[in-house]
């Protein structure tokens, strides 16, 4: 037999079908010019020592072969003995290691078989009524095609599907969309209406994310508040990466899951902007305020479920940083200014009440006063911190109040509102004999003691009603008892107690009269 002809004999190798999974596959045959034809195929498995034979059976029942050697492509003319105007069936037999491996057959009319291209270039992917829609430009001069797709997940083999006939400048396909796993798709085309025409090669992989992006499994930790009033939010655990099918590993455009961090600053609700969305890779610094943090996963089909955490407020307090002066016109707060042109947010809420009851006020941008202090004043009529109770005050500062991540905590402290000097007056002062020249004075704790850091000390005053001599005794804010000694029997005394704050002297309690009885010996 001549090499250019199809040889009408049995091929020159023993007859031994391997039934192996490897071997020749994806045979495609088509006309490449007016009188020339080409068949090509793929071979899976080790290629050393493999000889390929293109087999052909004609409608008459005669069968022949072309010897292709180690090549997986073979050209022949319309004079090679293969009928090109009638239906023929072709397949490849590969002889290797004393066994024959056979490809699936293709049955076609060679003359009418045109080489079709797979979808080339950009394949657009969208979601349509719970399904996947793929769309692409029809390759030039190839309108009229049958289209198939195959798809697989990381854990499943290829499954074949049909896109149906296409007859336009753009072609499309509806495919199944998986809820929770990524998929790899490939498409192929063949001439429409040409019986047995060969399929094109498979297209490049189209990588498609699951309909639901994976829920982010991450953990955060928050560092201690630094000297600058900010604390860093750090990611303890990276989000798990989506498992990808084989052809999508490495560079897989389309399957990307983007994780975004959504910050919601709960404190200081009177500021302009309460939420900010950032890339997860860019971990922000936060003030000491309370925040809700959500990690939102999204892919090309939109956002998925999010995971939310609450970051509580930093409750570390600065007992002396805030000065408060109460005058007839109202109240003014002073604190060390941060920098030039700072906006401050002053937030207060009654202690022991829900965080939702916080009130706040935003200052206009202000520069430090000559003493380097920033101030905030309010009148009694405003009702701010007007009730006689303990308030928790936090002051935040920002040079760019519209940027959520640029706030810092200036200070947190407690303040007793209303008329603190009167409200803090100790009650239930009682005197008990202690010895021949001393008494024990007790009182109920001042309301100021409910406000951490506010009560600086108690002062106990003792007045000798005879000599009008007065002595004052400072008492630690944690104590509610003192012993007065050096007293004389038979003399009338009055005792009073007051509660002082760092910036305010308290009001004396009602005078309590007492005397030590003269002891008469028998």
């Amino acid at each position: 037999c001549r090499t250019s002809e199809c040889c009408f004999q049995d091929p020159p190798y023993p007859d031994a079908d391997s039934g192996s999974a490897s071997g020749p596959r994806d045979l495609r045959c088509y006309r490449i010019s007016s009188d020339r034809y080409e068949c090509s195929w793929q071979y899976e498995g080790p290629t050393a020592g493999v000889s390929h034979f293109l087999r052909c059976c004609l409608s008459s029942g005669r069968c022949c072969y072309f010897a292709a050697g180690s090549a997986t492509r073979l050209q022949f003319s319309d004079q090679a003995g293969v009928s090109v105007l009638y239906t023929v069936t072709l397949w490849v037999e590969s002889w290797a290691r004393n066994q024959t491996e056979k490809s699936p057959e293709v049955t076609l009319q060679l003359y009418n078989s045109v080489k079709y291209e797979p979808p080339l270039g950009d394949i657009k992917v969208s979601k349509l009524a719970g399904q996947l829609r793929m769309e692409w430009e029809t390759p030039d001069n190839q309108v009229g095609a049958e289209v198939q797709f195959r798809h697989r997940t990381p854990s499943s083999p290829w499954k074949l599907g049909d896109c149906g006939p296409q007859d336009d400048d753009t072609e499309s396909c509806l495919c199944p969309l998986e809820m929770n796993v990524a998929q790899e798709f490939q498409l192929r085309r063949r001439q429409l209406g040409s019986q047995g025409s060969s399929w094109s090669k498979w297209s490049s992989p189209v990588c498609v994310p699951p309909e639901n992006p994976p829920q982010p499994q991450v953990r955060f930790s928050v560092e201690q508040l630094g000297q600058d009033g900010r604390r860093r939010l750090t990611l303890k655990e990276q989000p798990t990466q989506l498992e990808l099918p084989e052809g999508c590993q490495g560079l897989a455009p389309g399957t990307e899951v983007t994780y975004r961090l959504q910050l919601h600053m709960l404190s200081c609700p009177c500021k302009a902007k309460a939420t900010r969305t950032l890339h997860l890779g860019k971990m922000p610094y936060l003030s000491g305020a309370a925040y809700n943090v959500a990690v939102i996963s999204s892919n090309q089909f939109g956002p998925g479920l999010n995971q939310t955490w609450h970051i509580p407020a930093d409750t570390h307090t600065e007992p002396v940083a805030l000065n408060i002066s109460v005058g007839t016109n109202g109240t003014t707060m002073y604190w060390p200014a941060r920098a030039q042109s700072m906006t401050y947010c002053i937030e207060w809420q009654p202690v022991g009440q829900d965080g939702g009851l916080a009130t706040c006020s935003l200052t206009a941008p202000q520069d430090p006063d000559p003493a380097g202090m920033a101030t905030y004043s309010w009148s009694r009529e405003s009702g701010a911190m007007g009730q006689e109770k303990c308030y928790y005050i936090t002051i935040f500062a920002s040079a760019h109040p519209e940027k959520l991540t640029l706030w810092s905590t200036v200070l947190s402290t407690y303040h007793f509102g209303g008329n603190a000097s009167a409200a803090g007056t100790p009650h239930h002062v009682s005197v008990k004999n202690h010895s021949l020249d001393s008494v024990s004075v007790d009182w109920a704790p001042s309301l100021l003691s409910t406000c951490p850091g506010v009560l600086k000390e108690y002062v106990v005053r003792c007045r000798d009603e005879d000599s009008k001599q007065v002595s004052e005794h400072p008492v630690q804010p944690t104590e509610t008892q003192v012993t007065l000694s050096g007293l004389r029997a038979g003399v009338a005394y009055t005792v009073q107690v007051r509660a002082d704050t760092a910036w305010l002297r308290g009001v004396w309690s009602q005078p309590q009269r007492f005397s030590i009885e003269v002891q008469v010996s028998d």
Epitope: D10, C63, K102
Partner: nanobody
């Protein structure tokens, strides 16, 4: 000289089965691939199936795959075609063919009708 004689045809209902046989003589049967072809009324020849000399390789046209099975017994010089799930469109004269030189027998008629 080379001779091929087909038998086993007949009338069968749709969904039924037939087994065609082809007795070969006048050549070394075990050295050649063999085919079955058919010719429906008013149509040209149509190749149906092929089997290699040793029987290790079998091939079918798409529209009979899964329904027809080609086999051979080289000791008896016999070629067979087992036809299951027959359809009206399988109605034709079936010929066995020497795949190398195209020689064929006189054929056997298969008719599939309700």
């Amino acid at each position: 000289q080379l001779q091929l004689v087909e038998s086993g045809g007949g009338l069968v209902q749709p969904g039924g089965s037939l087994r065609l046989s082809c007795a070969a003589s006048g050549f070394t049967f075990s050295s050649y691939g063999m085919s079955w072809v058919r010719q429906a009324p008013g149509k040209g020849l149509e190749w149906v199936s092929y089997i290699s000399a040793g029987g290790g390789t079998t091939t079918y046209v798409d529209f009979v795959k899964g329904r027809f099975t080609i086999s051979r017994d080289n000791a008896k010089n016999m070629l067979y075609l087992q036809m299951n799930s027959l359809k009206p469109e399988d109605t034709a004269v079936y010929y066995c063919v020497h795949a190398a030189d195209g020689s064929r027998g006189q054929g056997t008629q298969v008719t599939v009708e309700p």
